[in-house]
C-alpha cells in the first residue's frame, strides 16, 4: 500500500538517465551545485522535485513509516546540497517496462540464463551495473554512492528484490559500543524459470561454506543451472558467487571476526522491486536514525588516532571514505586487522564499479 519505494525507484531511474543510462552519480547528482550549472544539475533538480511530489502523494498511506521519512529528509538534504528551487519543472516518470530484457528482436533467441549476452543482443549495448558493499562497522556503500556508517543491530536487508534477497545480521563490536559488526549473511537466489532452483547461501563468522545450504555448488538441475556458481580462492576467508543469469557477482569475506559483502549487479535487477519490499540498505543507504557520525566513535583499547591513521594509510593512501572507515573501525575495535576489511572493500569497488571516477568517496562529516 505504501508506495514510497516506487517513488525511490522512479527517482533512481530518472537520475541514472541523466548520465545516459550509466550507473554513476545517481544520488550525488554529478557535480555542479547551482541551478543550471554543472553536469546534469538542472536535470537533477527536476528529478528531485518529481521525487518530492511523488513522496507527497504517498503521505496519506506512508506518513508513519520510516521509508517515507527517510525519503523526505533525503530529498530535503539533496535539494539544499544542489541549490534546487522548490518550484519549477519536474521530470516525467520513467516508462515502467519489463525489468529484464526478453526475446523478440528477430535474432536467434539468446541464452536466457546469460543476462549480459541477452541484454546486449536486445539493446545493442552492455547493461549498466551497480555496486554496493557492506564491511567493518558496518559501513555501507549504496548503489547511489552514499557512504554511511550504521549502528544497525539485528537483521537488516541489504537487498530485497524480485531476484535476490540479502540480509546482514549485526551485533555490537564490543560491550557498550555504539558500533556493530556483521556476524551473519543470508543470501537467497530466487527461483528463476529455466535457470535456477531457489538457492540459499548462509555465511557466519568462522563458517564460510563454499556451497549453498543444500550442499550444491550451482543452480541445480535446470538447463541453466551452471549460470549460478560458487567458488573460493581462499577457503574460510573468501567466497565468490557468480549469478550470470542476473548479471551479478557477489564476494563475501571474513576479516577480523566480521563479514564483508560486496556486489556488482545489473541495474534492472537491482531496481526490480515493488512497494511491498521493505527498506534495502543498498538502495537507500542506512536509515537516518541508524547512522553514526565519525564524531560518535568511542575508542576502545590502546590504539591512538595517530596509530590508527598510520595503520590505515599503509594500505589506503587516499584519505577517502574507505580510509576514514578504516580509522573508525581500528579505533573502536582496537584491532589493527580491521584495516584489511576496508582495503578489500576498496579493491572490490575498483573491480566492480563501472565508473572509477566514483571510486573514492569523501565523507561530508
Amino acid at each position: 500500500q505504501c508506495k514510497i519505494l516506487r517513488c525511490n525507484a522512479e527517482y533512481v531511474s530518472s537520475t541514472l538517465s541523466l548520465r545516459g543510462g550509466g550507473s554513476s552519480g545517481a544520488l550525488r547528482g554529478g557535480g555542479g551545485g547551482g541551478r543550471g550549472g554543472g553536469v546534469g544539475s538542472g536535470g537533477l533538480c527536476r528529478a528531485l522535485r518529481s521525487y518530492a511530489l511523488c513522496t507527497r502523494r504517498t503521505a496519506r498511506t506512508c506518513r508513519g513509516d520510516l521509508a517515507f521519512h527517510s525519503a523526505v529528509h533525503g530529498i530535503e538534504d539533496l535539494m539544499i546540497q544542489h541549490n534546487c528551487s522548490r518550484q519549477g519543472p519536474t521530470a516525467p516518470p520513467p516508462p515502467r517496462g519489463p525489468a529484464l530484457p526478453g526475446a523478440g528482436s528477430g535474432l536467434p533467441a539468446p541464452d536466457p540464463c546469460d543476462y549480459e549476452g541477452r541484454f546486449s543482443r536486445l539493446h545493442g549495448r552492455p547493461p549498466g551495473f551497480l555496486h554496493c558493499a557492506s564491511f567493518g562497522d558496518p559501513h555501507v556503500r549504496s548503489f547511489h554512492h552514499h557512504f554511511h556508517t550504521c549502528r544497525v543491530q539485528g537483521a537488516w536487508p541489504l537487498l530485497d528484490n524480485d531476484f535476490l534477497f540479502v540480509q546482514a545480521t549485526s551485533s555490537p563490536m564490543a560491550l557498550g559500543a555504539n558500533a556493530t559488526a556483521t556476524r551473519k549473511l543470508t543470501i537467497i537466489f530466487k527461483n528463476m524459470q529455466e535457470c535456477i532452483d531457489q538457492k540459499v547461501y548462509q555465511a557466519e563468522v568462522d563458517n564460510l561454506p563454499v556451497a549453498f545450504e543444500d550442499g550444491s555448488i550451482n543452480g541445480g538441475d535446470r538447463p541453466g543451472g551452471s549460470s549460478l556458481s560458487i567458488q573460493t580462492a581462499n577457503p574460510g576467508n573468501h567466497v565468490e558467487i557468480q549469478a550470470a543469469y542476473i548479471g551479478t557477482t557477489i564476494i563475501i569475506r571474513q576479516t577480523a571476526g566480521q563479514l564483508s559483502f560486496s556486489i556488482k549487479v545489473a541495474e534492472d535487477v537491482a531496481m526490480a522491486f515493488s512497494a511491498e519490499q521493505d527498506l534495502q540498505l543498498c538502495v537507500g543507504g542506512c536509515p537516518p536514525s541508524q547512522r553514526l557520525s565519525r564524531s560518535e566513535r568511542n575508542r576502545r583499547g590502546a590504539i591512538t588516532i595517530d596509530t590508527a591513521r598510520r595503520l590505515c594509510k599503509e594500505g589506503l593512501p587516499v584519505e577517502d571514505a574507505y580510509f576514514h572507515s578504516c580509522v573508525f573501525d581500528v579505533l573502536i575495535s582496537g584491532d589493527p586487522n580491521f584495516t584489511v576489511a576496508a582495503q578489500a572493500a576498496l579493491e572490490d569497488a575498483r573491480a566492480f564499479l563501472p565508473d572509477l571516477e566514483k571510486l573514492h568517496l569523501f565523507p561530508s562529516d
Epitope: Q1, C2, R57, R60, T61, G64, D65, A67, L279
Partner: antibody, heavy 115, light 112 residues
Framework: EVQLVESGGGLVQPGGSLRLSCAAS????????MNWIRQAPGKGLEWIGM????????HYADSVKGRFTISRDNSKNTLYLQMNSLRAEDTAVYYC????????WGQGTMVTVSS | DVVLTQSPLSLPVTLGQPASISCRSS???????????LEWFQQRPGQSPRLLIY???NRFSGVPDRFSGSGSGTDFTLKISRVEAEDVGVYYC?????????FGQGTKLEIK
Amino acid sequence: EVQLVESGGGLVQPGGSLRLSCAASGFTFSNYGMNWIRQAPGKGLEWIGMIYYDSSEKHYADSVKGRFTISRDNSKNTLYLQMNSLRAEDTAVYYCAKGTTPDYWGQGTMVTVSS
Amino acid sequence: DVVLTQSPLSLPVTLGQPASISCRSSQSLETSDGDTFLEWFQQRPGQSPRLLIYEVSNRFSGVPDRFSGSGSGTDFTLKISRVEAEDVGVYYCFQVTHDPVTFGQGTKLEIK
C-alpha cells in the same frame, strides 16, 4: 510471514484500566507505523488510533482521545494500548494492524467492560 | 468526519454468480493530486479483517483476481466476478483520504 499477536484483554469494571500488547514478527517492526482498531460484538470496525514508526506522532479517534494511549517498544517489537477510564461502550475485540494504513491484522483480543 | 455508507447491508448470492457492493462517501475521496485512498477489507466469520483492494482498484498481494474495485469521487464498487464458498463474510470499505480514517458499516455476503 507477518504475524501480529494481541494479548492483555479481559474483563474490567467501568472506570478501570487495561493495557493491551501486540507482539510483531515477520517484518521490520521499527520501520512501520502501527494502528489499533476495534470491533464491538456484532458491530462494524472502528479505528482507534495510530503511532509513527519512531513514536514521534500519535493520532487518535475522538471517542478515545484523552483516555487511550498508544506506545511502542521497537527493541521488543511490541505495540501497546493503554486504556484508562474504560466505559461499557469500549467492550470490543481489539486488533493491532501493520502499516500507516493497515494491511496485516492480528487475531484480536477481547475486552469486556462490565460491572 | 467522512461517513461511508455501504449497500446492500446483506447480500445473498448463488455460488458461481457475480456480486457487487456499493460504498458511498459523504465527501469526495479524491486528493488535490488526483489520488483516491479507498480500500476494501474482507472479514470471514471468526477471523480478523484482510485487505483486498487498496487505492480503489489495486488488488493486495495474494488476493484472487475475481475481486475487483472501481469508482471515483464519492461512489465506489467492489465486485466479485464468481462467488465462491470462501467469500462468505463481511466486506468493509475504508477511506484514508481524510482524517480521521473511517470504515463503512459493512456488507454481509452469504450464500443463497
